[in-house]
Amino acid sequence: QECTKFKVSSCRECIESGPGCTWCQKLNFTGPGDPDSIRCDTRPQLLMRGCAADDIMDPTSLAETQEDHNGGQKQLSPQKVTLYLRPGQAAAFNVTFRRAKGYPIDLYYLMDLSYSMLDDLRNVKKLGGDLLRALNEITESGRIGFGSFVDKTVLPFVNTHPDKLRNPCPNKEKECQPPFAFRHVLKLTNNSNQFQTEVGKQLISGNLDAPEGGLDAMMQVAACPEEIGWRNVTRLLVFATDDGFHFAGDGKLGAILTPNDGRCHLEDNLYKRSNEFDYPSVGQLAHKLAENNIQPIFAVTSRMVKTYEKLTEIIPKSAVGELSEDSSNVVHLIKNAYNKLSSRVFLDHNALPDTLKVTYDSFCSNGVTHRNQPRGDCDGVQINVPITFQVKVTATECIQEQSFVIRALGFTDIVTVQVLPQCECRCRDQSRDRSLCHGKGFLECGICRCDTGYIGKNCECQTQGRSSQELEGSCRKDNNSIICSGLGDCVCGQCLCHTSDVPGKLIYGQYCECDTINCERYNGQVCGGPGRGLCFCGKCRCHPGFEGSACQCERTTEGCLNPRRVECSGRGRCRCNVCECHSGYQLPLCQECPGCPSPCGKYISCAECLKFEKGPFGKNCSAACPGLQLSNNPVKGRTCKERDSEGCWVAYTLEQQDGMDRYLIYVDESRECVAGPN
C-alpha cells in the first residue's frame, strides 16, 4: 500500500488521500519543525516511526445488510444494504437470487400486419385462449395485450397512391386496412375472450419495401406504460414478423430527419406522429426496453432468425424463436423463450455518479464463476436454486449520502443500496480537553486546534503584538541563512515546513533543511525504494540486509573472501560484495600490491633480532616487530638480501599474511660477513 498525500493537515484529509493512508493521533508525535502531515502515512511507516497500533486511525469500508420480510415472495435478498465507503477502498456484500415459480407475467403480442403475414393473422385470431392457458401454466397471474404495426406511411416505405393507401393489398378483392405505423389494439387483460374479439377485428394491411417499422412500434410499447397497461411484473413483448426492420437513419429516405425522441405519442391508440420522427436506433430501443424492464421475444420466420439473433446481442434479456410460416407454433415458441429468458440472470445497477464504481463476481449454480464484471451474469438458473453475486462498491472520493438500486434484469425485485461516506476519524481525544493546548484550543486527533489569535503546536503562541523579527531569529540556521531554508513558514519561532507537491517528498527538520527525496537513487528509486531503505536528510538509511549509498546492495561478503575466508585479505573493506582495497592493493581480493615499496629494507632489523637476537631491536624485538612471525622452514614470498647492523649480508624471505604489515619471515642461518681490510 502507498500513501500519496497533498497538503494534509487533518485526519479527515489524510483518510481522503487514499486507502493506504493512516493517521497517527499520538500526542507529541511530531518533532520541532515537523509538519502535521507527517502524521499521515502508511501503517508500517507510522509503526516504524513509533506510533502505537492503537494510535493509528484507519477507518475501513463496511457493508451492513438488512432483510425486509414484509411483502410477497422475494427473488433477491437482502432487500436493503447500507455501505460506509472510505475513498479507494471497496465494500463488498452478497446478493442472492432465488428464481421463483409462478411469478406474474404481462405479455404484449406485437404483430407485423404487412400482407405476407395474412395466414399468421388467421392463426393469431384463434390464439387468445391458448395463449392465456399457456401463461397460466407458468404463472398464477398472466395478462395479454395486442398491438400491430406496418410502417411509416410515406414513400418509399408504402405506396402513397390514394388507391393504394386505401387498400394496400395486391389482391383488390381482399378486405385490407390502410397502412399505419403502430396501433395499440388491446390493453393488457386477463380476459381471453376480449383478446379473441379485438384481434378478430384486425385486418391485414400492406407496405412497399421489405423491412417493416417494427422498431417504431416497439419504442411506443415501451414508452407508453400507462396506455399499454404494464404492471410492475415480468414484462414480455412478443414481436412477430417475417421480415427485417428499419432503424435510425432510414427515415431520411422519406425526408424524416428528426431523431426519435423515445416518448409516447399515442393518440386514439395510434402512433400518428410516426412521419415526424425517424426510426429509433437499436441502442436507443435497447436502452428504453431495459429502462422499463421489458424483455422482447422475437418470433420470426426461419430466414430472419440470424438477423434477429444479432439484434438480441445488443438488447439485453431478449430471445429469438423460429416462427412457423403460419404462426401455428407461437404458443410453444413463447414458452421456450420465456424459460430461456428466466434462466438467464443479469444483475445490474442503475445510473451512478462517476464517484462510485461497482463490480460483480458471479458464483453460478453450475460451478461457473465470473469475476470483476460490470454486471452479474448467470445462465441455466433453475427454479428455487439460489445463486450468489458478490457486489463490490468503491468510492473515489468522500461521497455525499445517496442510494442506488440493484435489480435482476427482467425481474421486478430490487436491492436498495444506501451509500454513506466513511471519512471521519473517531479519535479518542475529542473530549474537548483544552489543557494540552494551553487552554487556547482543543485536541483533535493529536493536534491542537487553536482559538483565533493563537498558534503553535500547543497554541502556545499568541500572534498579537509580537514582531515577526523576534520570532524569525529562531527559524534561521545562522544570520546568513534564509528563513526555514525557504521551504517553510516561521510560525511563532518555529518552522512549519511546506507540504511538497512531489509525491513521497516530505520536508522536515528544525529549519526545513531536510527532505525524504534528495538522496542517491538506485533502479530509479530513492534509496532503492521503500523496501530497501529510507531517505533521511540526504543520506540513505538502509533496512537490515541492504547496504550501499543508495541501499543498492544486498548485504553479503561471499565475493570478498580469499581462500582462507578472510575478507579482502585484511587489506580492504567489503562493500556491496566487492572489495575496496587499501591504496596500492589490487582487486579482486587485495592480495597483491605491485606498486608498493619493497618491505625488505623495512624489516632487516627485525630479521636480525628475530633470528640472531642482535641489532638495534635486540632487546625488545617482539614489540618492535609485532606483525612478523619467524618460520623455521623456508617460505614462499619476496626474497630479500640486506646488510645488517654489523655489515653482514642477511638473506631472508617474507611471505605476506592476511592484514596490513603482517609477514611470515624465514631467515637463512648463514650470514655473509665480508672481512674488513687488513
Epitope: A290, E291, N350, A351, S403, V405, D413
Partner: nanobody, 114 residues
C-alpha cells in the same frame, strides 16, 4: 422524459407539521423517489428516499421526525414532516431515479418560524 411536480410547501410554526407531495409523470419506470433540501447559501443535502418496493432511507438530521411514503399507482411520493425546527427551513426538492438517470423537480419552499 419524466416531469416532477412538488407541492405542500409553505410557512409553518416550529414544532408543527407539514406534508409534501411529489407527483411523477412520463414514460420511464421510476425505481426510487426521494427528497433533498437546500438551505440558503448551503449545499443540497439528502433528506429521505423510498424504493419501489417500499425500502426507506433517512438522513441523520430527520430520523424519527420525518416519514417518507409512496403511492406506486399514482407515481407519487409524500414527505410527512413532524416536530419541525427552524433549521429545517429550506427549499425541498424531489428526485426520481429511473434506470439510466435521475430527474429533479423545481422544489418547494418550507419556512419554519420560531
Amino acid at each position: 422524459e419524466v416531469q416532477l411536480v412538488e407541492s405542500g410547501g409553505g410557512l409553518v410554526q416550529a414544532g408543527g407539521s407539514q406534508k409534501l407531495s411529489c407527483a411523477a409523470s412520463g414514460s420511464t419506470l421510476i425505481y426510487t423517489m426521494g427528497w433533498y433540501r437546500q438551505a440558503l447559501g448551503k449545499k443540497r443535502v439528502f433528506v429521505a428516499s423510498i424504493s419501489r418496493d417500499g425500502s426507506t432511507i433517512y438522513g441523520d438530521s430527520v430520523k424519527g421526525r420525518f416519514t417518507i411514503s409512496r403511492d406506486n399507482a399514482k407515481n407519487t411520493a409524500y414527505l410527512q414532516m413532524n416536530s419541525l425546527k427552524p433549521e429545517d427551513t429550506a427549499v425541498y426538492v424531489c428526485k426520481a431515479e429511473g434506470w439510466y438517470q435521475g430527474y429533479w423537480g423545481q422544489g418547494t419552499q418550507v419556512t419554519v418560524s420560531s
